[in-house]
Interface confidence: low
């Protein structure tokens, strides 16, 4: 069935900033998609088009992106009468119309909004759930429920505390299924809240952009200690492991790293890549840390390579790869990491996201599907992670509705699959290997 109408509008994300929402109509109904946006954006990702009109939303309006959809993309797609199941054709058409390498003409937020809506319409057109349609587009013969990576302690640029490292996550890999993983995550989260409240006072349990706590601590090790305590108190020591998103590009300073970058600058306290790697190795030794994302700056290729070769854990590339096939290919060649963080808005279309995922998986990497810090109630990535069988998703803490929207959708998917549901569990890095 072809597209009858497309209408885009400005809506608000979870941080109160404008973002793009797209309504796409076919004879089967209305299909709506909303685009997320990141706080820390990598320099190699597709361009999120903002108006830069300082008199409106502090320059963060997206009326230009909306206009590109309504005035240019919509008429073109409607006139072409392409079937909504032809995801690749539609995405390629938009990319060709844009004509830039980083989607800077229309904006990745414009192209992605339409692309997501097309994908949703395609699933209904085929009469299958969205996750099954995505599996089909990706050439996967099965679907797998992921291990959720709950971001429960926030630091870095996202938080107002002194903590340098951006995210401390819990992964309930020992759960029997996704529902149990949610229960474990929620119980650890509430135990963590009590632990933080006892140690740092009630104010320290205020939540950040992604639903995690941001206690005013400086030492990253203290964050891990809090997690270890909460996991123990909840009674899940044998079922929960820890992941971190360091976002080291945020505190990279002239070839070195400043773990106290939120204080006045003092080059004498910067540490070398090797010293930072040693710190990570001490974390791995002392805590059940199984995954570290962006441990080094996006251009510190040597440090990545050395660490991945010796750490023995999952090393995730986000700022390093920005879901960009060219960056992924380079990282594969240089053995810089062993897992891709997949953010649909970093590359700007469903087709390219699927290609990036397949490229990573074909080279033996893991893939972790991710939200952005500026989210909406859209649940596309929940179906995406199931259809792509990546086995792991991070979409915040079990708190804040825009985060739980995704987790709740995963609960529904698991329920729908019934006894056919597979949960990645301890195989989260390579869920298809048995």
């Amino acid at each position: 069935m072809s597209i009858l109408k497309i209408h885009a509008r400005e809506i608000f994300d979870s941080r109160g900033n404008p973002t793009v929402e797209v309504d796409l109509f076919t004879s089967k109904g209305l299909f709506r998609a909303a685009v997320p946006s990141g706080a820390s954006t990598g320099i190699y990702e597709a361009l999120e088009l903002r108006d830069n009109d300082k008199t409106r939303y502090m320059g963060k309006g997206v009326s230009k992106a909306v206009e590109h959809i309504n005035k240019t993309i919509a008429p073109a797609l409607v006139s072409k009468k392409l079937n909504v199941t032809e995801q690749e054709k539609i995405d390629k058409l938009m990319i060709e119309m844009d004509g830039t390498e980083n989607k800077s003409k229309f904006g990745a937020n414009a192209i992605l909004g339409v692309s997501l809506a097309v994908c949703k319409a395609g699933a209904v057109e085929k009469g299958v759930p969205l996750y099954r349609h995505i599996a089909d587009l990706a050439g996967n013969s099965e679907v797998i429920l992921p291990v959720p990576a709950f971001n429960v302690i926030n630091g870095g640029s996202h938080a107002g505390n002194k903590l340098a490292m951006q995210e401390f996550m819990i992964l309930p890999v020992g759960a029997a299924n996704f529902r149990e993983a949610m229960r474990i995550g929620a119980e650890v989260y509430h135990n963590l809240k009590n632990v933080i409240k006892e140690k740092y006072g009630k104010d320290a349990t205020n939540v950040g952009d992604e639903g995690g706590f941001a206690p005013n601590i400086l030492e990253n090790k203290e964050g891990l200690e809090l997690l270890k305590t909460a996991i123990g108190k909840a009674g899940y020591t044998d079922k929960v492991v820890i992941g971190m998103d360091v976002a080291a590009s945020e505190f990279f300073r002239s070839g070195k790293y400043d773990l106290d970058f939120k204080s006045p600058d003092d080059p004498s306290r910067y540490i070398s890549p090797d010293q930072l790697a040693d710190l990570y190795k001490s974390f791995i030794k002392d805590y059940p840390v199984v995954s570290i994302e962006d441990p080094f700056d996006a251009d510190d290729w040597g440090a990545w390579q050395k660490f991945t070769a010796s750490a023995g854990i999952q090393v995730v590339g986000d700022d390093l790869t920005v879901t960009n096939p060219k960056r992924i290919a380079k990282a594969v060649n240089e053995k810089s990491c062993n897992c891709l963080l997949l953010k649909v808005n970093q590359i700007g279309s469903v087709t390219e996201s699927l290609q990036a995922c397949k490229l990573a998986q074909a080279n033996g990497w893991g893939v972790m599907v991710s939200h952005r810090s500026g989210e909406t109630e859209d649940t596309f990535i929940a179906d995406l992670v199931v259809g792509l069988c990546t086995g792991q998703i991070k979409t915040g803490a079990p708190c804040r509705s825009e985060r739980l929207a995704k987790y709740n959708q995963l609960l529904r998917i698991e329920e729908e699959l019934g006894s056919k549901a597979k949960f990645a569990g301890r195989n989260f890095r390579n869920p298809l290997a048995k």
């Epitope: 009469g127 299958v128 599996a135 013969s141 699959l417 006894s419 056919k420 597979k422």
Partner: antibody, heavy 119, light 107 residues
Framework: QVQLVQSGAEVKKPGASVKVSCKAS????????MNWVRQAPGQGLEWMGY????????KYNEKFKGRVTMTTDTSTSTAYMELRSLRSDDTAVYYC????????????WGQGTLVTVSS | DIQMTQSPSSLSASVGDRVTITCRAS??????LTWYQQKPGKAPKLLIY???TLPEGVPSRFSGSGSGTDFTLTISSLQPEDFATYYC?????????FGQGTKLEIK
């Protein structure tokens, strides 16, 4: 290539039980749901149920509930279907069938096992 | 349970003919429909899934259409190897049920 090889023909008396095996090869056994379908002589196809070798989840056709048990042995990539309290109208060819791309589509079938129930 | 009704029950045709078999579901099954071909003494073979998608290796003379409750299997130009029994099956929830079959014979 994917192959499903079933056990040989069986002759059983009414009231007895039969256990049919289906050995899978050419794919990761735990990655696909295994269904059982039967076909009485000269008749159509009838779905009996499925088992998910990944987690041993089962779903049975109400018609066979209480009489059928589906199991797997992942170490040998083998699925089993046991039918109890056999009656003469259970005489049929029993097929195992692997689910493909979309749940509910059977893209690979065993060669079938004829079970004859006769006194 | 969803009932699947095929028509006709049997059909005689010649090589080169265009043949259509229909399948009706007792309720809306969207596109959750599969067609199988079965030859005597053999297991069924997947022919079309999702109402209209051909798996790899199935000749393009076979096509499927329909959604909701009414579905059609068409063979555009019958070949000698196409004489067999054809079954439709829904997979819109369990129990999966099959049509009673359409036997395609040589005229």
């Amino acid at each position: 290539q994917v192959q499903l090889v079933q056990s040989g023909a069986e002759v059983k008396k009414p009231g007895a039980s039969v256990k049919v095996s289906c050995k899978a090869s050419g794919y990761t056994f735990t990655s696909s749901v295994m269904n059982w379908v039967r076909q009485a002589p000269g008749q159509g196809l009838e779905w009996m149920g499925y088992i998910n070798p990944y987690n041993d989840g089962t779903k049975y056709n109400e018609k066979f509930k209480g009489r059928v048990t589906m199991t797997t042995d992942t170490s040998t990539s083998t699925a089993y279907m046991e039918l109890r309290s056999l009656r003469s109208d259970d005489t049929a060819v029993y097929y195992c069938a692997r689910e493909g791309f979309y749940y509910g589509n059977f893209d690979n079938w065993g060669q079938g096992t004829l079970v004859t129930v006769s006194s | 349970d969803i009932q699947m009704t095929q028509s006709p029950s049997s059909l005689s045709a010649s090589v080169g003919d265009r043949v259509t078999i229909t399948c009706r579901a007792s309720e809306n099954i969207y596109s959750y429909l599969t067609w199988y071909q079965q030859k005597p003494g053999k297991a069924p073979k997947l022919l079309i899934y999702n109402a209209k998608t051909l798996p790899e290796g199935v000749p393009s003379r076979f096509s499927g259409s329909g959604s909701g409750t009414d579905f059609t299997l068409t063979i555009s130009s019958l070949q000698p190897e196409d004489f067999a029994t054809y079954y439709c099956q829904h997979h819109y929830g369990t129990p999966y049920t099959f049509g009673q079959g359409t036997k395609l014979e040589i005229k």
